[in-house]
Interface confidence: low
């Protein structure tokens, strides 16, 4: 049999008991698709959550985090405390980044400074708790007599032996 509940549009529910129309979703509930037999309860943005978008009969409320917190998870399912730049959140609260690490955001963990020498470069600007180091040209590039016109060595395709 054809499911005639498909007649009920979003914002209503198909009530086969008492209602003689497709019943509108009650206050604080919604149905985002047609043919629903119930409406879903609207999400409430309470506590550390604040409302970014009000609930309507056809769509759920959307939450943000209050000042000092940031969203985590799909659809901002959690709020996590902000820290300052140069800090990371631990179980004991916000802690300064250890020497050699940095965090340039209010969220996330401290990450190690870039190791310039791995790329054969030198440190141009030292790192801080808030900023990564800035790598500069390699020391050899800066030696007297080095020609800036020297073309770079051609890159080899993987799996090919040098000619």
């Amino acid at each position: 049999l054809q499911d005639l509940c498909s007649n009920c549009p979003a914002g209503t529910f198909c009530d086969n008991n008492r209602s003689q129309i497709c019943s509108p979703c009650p206050p604080n509930s919604f149905s985002s698709a047609g043919g629903q037999r119930t409406c879903d309860i609207c999400r409430q943005c309470k506590g550390v959550f604040k409302t970014r978008k009000e609930c309507s009969s056809t769509s759920n409320a959307e939450c943000d985090c209050i000042s000092g917190y940031h969203c985590l998870g799909a659809e901002c399912s959690m709020c996590e405390q902000d820290c300052k730049q140069g800090q990371e959140l631990t179980k004991k609260g916000c802690k300064d980044c250890c020497f050699g690490t940095f965090n340039d955001q209010k969220r996330g963990i401290c990450r190690p400074w870039t190791n310039c020498s791995l790329d054969g470069k030198s440190v141009l600007v030292n790192g801080t708790k808030e900023r990564d180091v800035v790598c500069g040209p390699s020391p050899a590039d800066l030696s007297p007599g080095a020609s800036s016109a020297t073309p770079p060595a051609p890159a080899r395709e993987p799996g090919h032996s040098p000619q």
């Epitope: 054809q2 008492r18 209602s19 497709c22």
Partner: antibody, heavy 119, light 107 residues
């Protein structure tokens, strides 16, 4: 297949209470509302009311509140409409029809019973 | 009660014609509009429900459209078997109400 069977014609004397029947088959009788619709000769259609066979809950058009009484017999999957004190104004074709829930359409109709009120 | 008005009570058309029958509600019925066909022998069938959805077994030459208070039924290629009276009906609010019908005849 879904069927709503109604007698083709009924004759009743003015003032003599009578019942029209509608026998349903081909679907779960208790899951669909049975509705009754009136059509006077050469006129449009008027919704009288409906009944939910599962618990006999009824809704009536105020215009027919004192005229029609809807009942069902679940054991025989039959719906009834009793008309009180019939007059010539009640001479019409009466259709039974079903619907699944409130705003869904009347998806299947009986053939209609022609009621003649005459002495 | 919601009044349903079919301004054209009868309509003549030729076989193969495209025919449009209109229906107006006295208030917004949010697309809860159904169309029925009543043959000369009294048989009534559902054609279209919720403004534009074709009931199972109904030929695709029938279509419906509209919104708010204005709705229409279109038969794209009129056939002999389409000779009937067509009724609109609102399913928005109790009591359910029908239009007065449009009788379709062949020229």
């Amino acid at each position: 297949q879904v069927q709503l069977q109604q007698p083709g014609a009924e004759l009743v004397r003015p003032g003599a209470s009578m019942k029209l029947s509608c026998k349903a088959s081909g679907y779960t009788f208790t899951s669909y509302w049975i509705n009754w619709v009136k059509q006077r000769p050469g006129q449009g259609l008027e919704w009288i009311g409906n009944i939910y066979p599962s618990d006999s809950y009824t809704n009536y058009n105020q215009k027919f509140k004192d005229k029609a009484t809807l009942t069902v017999d679940k054991s025989s999957s039959t719906a009834y409409m009793q008309l009180s004190s019939p007059t010539s104004e009640d001479s019409a074709v009466y259709y039974c029809t079903r619907l699944y829930y409130g705003s869904s359409p009347f998806d299947y109709w009986g053939q209609g019973t022609t009621l003649t009120v005459s002495s | 009660d919601i009044q349903m008005t079919q301004t054209t009570s009868s309509l003549s058309a030729s076989l193969g014609d495209r025919v449009t029958i209109s229906c107006r509600a006295s208030q917004d019925i949010s697309n809860y509009l159904n169309w029925y066909q009543q043959k000369p022998d009294g048989t009534v069938k559902l054609l279209i429900y919720h403004t534009s959805r074709l009931h199972s077994g109904v030929p695709p030459r029938f279509s419906g459209s509209g919104s708010g208070t204005n709705y229409s039924l279109t038969i794209s290629n009129l056939e002999q078997e389409d000779i009937a009276t067509y009724f609109c009906q609102q399913g928005h609010t109790l009591p359910r109400t029908f239009g007065g019908g449009t009788k379709l005849e062949i020229k």
